[in-house]
Amino acid sequence: RVDRCSLQPCRNGGLCLDLGHALRCRCRAGFAGPRCEHDLDDCAGRACANGGTCVEGGGAHRCSCALGFGGRDCRERADPCAARPCAHGGRCYAHFSGLVCACAPGYMGARCEFPVHPDGASALPAAPPGLRPGDPQR
């Protein structure tokens, strides 16, 4: 008897079942149709909260979360200050745009990483123009 499944009729990784009187394809999540030929929209009806965008892949939806949010559906508020990103005693605050560092006197930069020289100049490398000490990270 010919193994009709050897022809690999099931698409997209579907499991072939030879029932004798018929072939049946058991489709992986995210696929449908007699031969699993239809790629379902993983993101259909699935909302990512707080400005996150849904990304299809492997039959399961995934949320790409906006800055400041995390979790499966972007419903959890991420803690941008967890890793203590503000150097030299800077105080870290969660901010709508991510985080902001209040720098201790004598330091500046988005992460308080640059010392301010006594003459008022800073040891900033070529930094983006317009970034002031204590400005929130975009």
Epitope: R77, D79, C81, G89, A94, A102, P105, G134, D135
Partner: antibody, heavy 123, light 111 residues
Framework: QEQLVESGGGLVQPEGSLTLTCTAS?????????MCWVRQAPGKGLEWIAC????????TDYANWAKGRFSISKTSSTTVTLQMTSLTVADTATYFC???????????????WGPGTLVTVSS | QVLTQTPSPVSAAVGGTVTISCQAS????????LAWYQQKPGQPPKLLIY???SLASGVPSRFKGSGAGTQFTLTISDLECDDAATYYC????????????FGGGTEVVVK
Amino acid sequence: QEQLVESGGGLVQPEGSLTLTCTASGFSFSSSGYMCWVRQAPGKGLEWIACISGGSSGDTDYANWAKGRFSISKTSSTTVTLQMTSLTVADTATYFCARDVYIDSTIFNFNLWGPGTLVTVSS
Amino acid sequence: QVLTQTPSPVSAAVGGTVTISCQASQSVYNNNNLAWYQQKPGQPPKLLIYAASSLASGVPSRFKGSGAGTQFTLTISDLECDDAATYYCQGTYYSSGWYSTFGGGTEVVVK
């Protein structure tokens, strides 16, 4: 509606200990800046005690006079405690919980306060 | 660091103007990290002014903050009976760590 409520106040003997709790509703600490404690002796002014980061870093700041006897900690995403030891009559006060937020490059802006809880130290 | 408020108490008639001074023994953080609070008996303080001169949300424009460095002023114009309260200035500093101090308070009496 964002709210803070303090609890745990009451009468305590000199040299005794007490733990105050601040509970938030309507927001979680991780999405705010720092949570702080401020006290006010009867008929007197305000006195800052300590702050703790609302996030998971647990960074703390203390008034010099409070170091050693007072300890601030975050017990959940909505509760902060203040442990007080070796209490004296001078610690008799209303203890307020307040939220410190960053606004316009300034910090220690207490834009949300609880109603306070009274601690009386007396024998 | 000490914040000295003067005068106390201060009184004025409804519709009048009062000015409260706050003198810091050293410059506050960034020269402008000073806030003003209003407190009524039996209530917690309420943030009025932050960054020395910025009005907090919901606060009427009759309240005006000014100053920088070590000298700050709160002016309340067009006084209303509801303005009767104690007002506190609060400065923020850094010296091997962050800390904050309050002024002693100024009681405003509205006649």
